[in-house]
Structures are given as C-alpha cells and as structure tokens.
C-alpha cells in the first residue's frame, strides 16, 4: 500500500526549495502538472505546466520553476529566494480543473524561519544542504515527526483522486487526512 | 545500518530476460528512491533509472525504455530491474542505489550502493 | 542531454602529492554536482555532494569546488589507499549522466 505522509522540509529565508514529485507515465505523460499551496480550504494553484511537448521547457512564474520530464514520469520544482509567508502545505497535482486534480504524493510541509546571518541567500548557502536522517541532528529533507493527525481541508463538493499503483483511491468531501509520521 | 543486497551473477543468452533484485534494510524502504545505474567491465558509470518504492512509479532513460521494468516489492523490502532483448552490450555490473535525500527531494547523489549484480550475455 | 568531461582520464602521482582532478558540464549545471572514488571490484562511494560538501566519513584532504560548469576535484595530500577511478556526475536535470571517470596511480 502507498503511504500518505507528510514530509517536512525546513529553510532560512533566502534558500531555495528543490523537489520532485513522481507520476505514473502511462497515465499522466501528457497531462498538465500544477504547483499548488493549500490556503484554507482551498488550494490554491502556483505555476502550472504546458502540455508536454517532445522537449520539455521549463515554466518559470516568479520565484518558481517547473520542469516537466514526460518521459521519466517526474516534474521538478524550484521555489527560489524562499520567505517566511511561503511557510504552508504545498502539493503536486495533475491539473485538470479545479475542481478535479490527481493529486501526487507526498505533500510538502514547507517551514521557513528568518536567516540567522546578515544576508540570507548569499551564493554559498543559498540552499539548504542538510538532507540527512531524522536520527541526525540536522533537519531532514524528508518525513519527519509532525503530529500523528494533521488536517488538512480539501475544496467543498470536490472530488480529490489519489493516483496510487493500479488503483486509485476518491476521497470525496475530503475535511481531513490522517497522515502517517515516518521514522527512519 | 543502511545495506542494499543484491541477487548473485546471471549468465543469460542473447535474447533473454534477466531480473535483478536488491534487498534493502537499515532504512524505511518507502522513504527513499532507488535508481539503478550500470558499469560495462573497463567502462564507465551509467544511470538507467529511478523507481519510488512508495507510490511504485518508476522511470528510465530512452536507451532502456523499452526493454526495462523496475518494480518493488514493499512487503520484502525488495526492489527489482527487469532487463529483456538481452544483447551481447548489456553485460555489465548492475548496482542497485540509494539516493541521499528522500524520495521527495531533487537530490540525485547516490549515497548506498548494493554490491552489484554481474550479468553475463554470451551464447 | 548534459555531458560530463572530466580531465585527465588518467594521471600519476606521488604519495603527498596534491592532486587535480576537473570536470566541465556541457552547459551551467548550477552546484548540481557529485564526486565517486570507485576502487577496482567494488561499488562507488560518494565522496562530494552539491560540488562541495564532504560526505560524512570521506578524509578531510578530499574536497570539491566549482559552480556553473566548471568543477574541481582535490585530493590535498595523496595516500595511498586514495587509489582509484573517480567519476563526476551531474543532477540538474534529467537524464542523470557521469564524466568518463579519471583514474589515479601512484607514481
């Protein structure tokens, strides 16, 4: 079974986020993929992709790029020059419309705290490097502890479809996920 | 500790099928990619792909596409690579990886290695 | 596809020696760059992460530098069990490829 979790990813102001979010190519190669941060109850969506062409371009809006990689099932996400409000629950998801999106796992809880240094995002550290185990004292690019029950609000009268390997999953009316925390 | 076994040597002629396996323990399976990369005795290091033990998607390059499959088993903590059309080019030492960041991070260092599965095609 | 050349793709040096090892990408791959040392008949070790970060346990006289597409490789003070075929490899994007590797003898 697929594991829903929540993954923690922790930066100072003026770092650059860097993720990757995998799809299943025989389903959605030629789909759109969107960039969303859930605001409420709603989603709200970021930057969206074109409809794959055979070379994939990279769209960049604002402070975000997404490079589509249609024949590897994977869409990268840049979030540059990171800032405290970016601080939420961000998701990939296949666009549709809004009211239906695929959404693709893990959704990312992003935390971003002021820069201890006088110039954040300075060449040398402008992303975060430590991306070691939970059982290390660095913060972990990765599921780590968060609460067992996380809620999360889904649109009202919104159908949200969990792509999982050879099934998928309608939560309909979704009000809350339980998400389960990963220890190494 | 972080360990990745793989299944022993394969001997296989031109036009079989060979499958892989790399036993991971140490670790959450789930959490983390594994990629497969290949070495053709004397050559270089060559990646092939990626696949995420927790959704089950996989991907690999063009060269591979339509002669690869990588698949998982959750329960074993197993992951597979499935070569078919087997050619005398394919004889290589194939390492299964672990990827330094988890599954959700754009960090492709490749952090574990299995010991690596020699594969001999000859007829 | 990005390609990776490393320079030399072979060299000898002395035990002490301070040893050079380049690597150009075909276009900027940022800080998008890995180091492996491979000895004969084992797997790969990463050595350096992101260009130049040294992975947990690799002797403090190995480092890396370099953004963009140019690359550098140290070894500050030869041993030798340093020894090997080391190889660059790049992530900025996708397909992941490697530099043709460089191997090192001890003169």
């Known amino acids: 079974t697929t594991e829903l979790t929540e993954e923690k990813y922790e930066y100072k102001e003026g770092q650059t986020l860097e993720v990757k979010c995998d799809y299943a190519l025989e389903k959605y190669a030629n789909s759109r993929k969107a960039w969303q941060k859930m605001e409420g109850k709603m989603p709200k969506i970021l930057a969206k992709t074109e409809r794959p062409s055979e070379n994939s371009h990279p769209v960049q809006v604002g402070r975000i790029t997404l490079e589509d990689y249609p024949d590897h099932g994977l869409l990268q996400v840049r979030m540059t020059n990171l800032q405290v409000e970016d601080s939420g629950l961000y998701q990939c998801v296949i666009y549709q419309h809004p009211k239906e999106s695929h959404v693709l796992f893990n959704p990312i809880c992003l935390v971003v705290t002021k820069g201890s240094s006088g110039t954040p995002g300075s060449s040398e550290n402008s992303t975060q490097n430590v991306y070691r185990t939970p059982s290390t004292t660095a913060k972990a690019l990765g599921p780590r502890y968060t609460s067992p029950r996380t809620v999360t609000q889904a649109p009202p009268e919104s159908t949200v479809v969990v792509s999982t390997p050879g099934s998928e999953i309608n939560l309909t009316n979704v009000t809350d996920i339980i998400r389960v925390p990963v220890f190494n | 500790q972080v360990q990745l076994v793989q299944s022993g040597a394969e001997v296989k002629k031109p036009g079989a099928s060979v499958k892989v396996s790399c036993k991971a323990s140490g670790y959450t399976f789930t959490s983390y990619d594994i990629n497969w990369v290949r070495q053709a005795t004397g050559q270089g290091l060559e990646w092939m792909g990626w696949m995420n033990p927790n959704s089950g998607n996989s991907g690999s390059v063009k060269k591979f596409r339509d002669r690869v499959t990588m698949t998982r088993n959750t329960s074993i903590s197993t992951a597979y690579m499935e070569l078919s059309s087997l050619r005398s080019e394919d004889t290589a030492v194939y390492y299964c990886?672990?990827?330094?960041?988890?599954?959700?991070?754009?960090?492709?260092?490749?952090?574990?290695w299995g010991q690596g599965t020699l594969v001999t095609v000859s007829s | 596809d990005i390609q990776m050349t490393q320079s030399p793709s072979s060299l000898s040096a002395s035990v002490g020696d301070r040893v050079t090892i380049t690597c150009q990408a075909s276009r900027d791959i940022s800080k998008y760059l890995n180091w492996y040392q491979q000895k004969p008949g084992k797997a790969p070790k990463l050595q350096i992460y992101d260009a130049s970060n040294l992975e947990t346990g690799v002797p403090s006289r190995f480092s890396g530098s370099g953004s963009g597409t140019d690359f550098t490789f140290t070894i500050s003070s030869l041993q030798p069990e340093d020894i090997a075929t080391y190889y660059c490899q790049h992530y900025d994007n996708i397909p992941i490829t490697f530099g043709q590797g460089t191997r090192l003898e001890i003169k």
């Open positions: 990886v672990r990827l330094i960041g988890y599954s959700s991070a754009w960090k492709w260092s490749f952090q574990h």
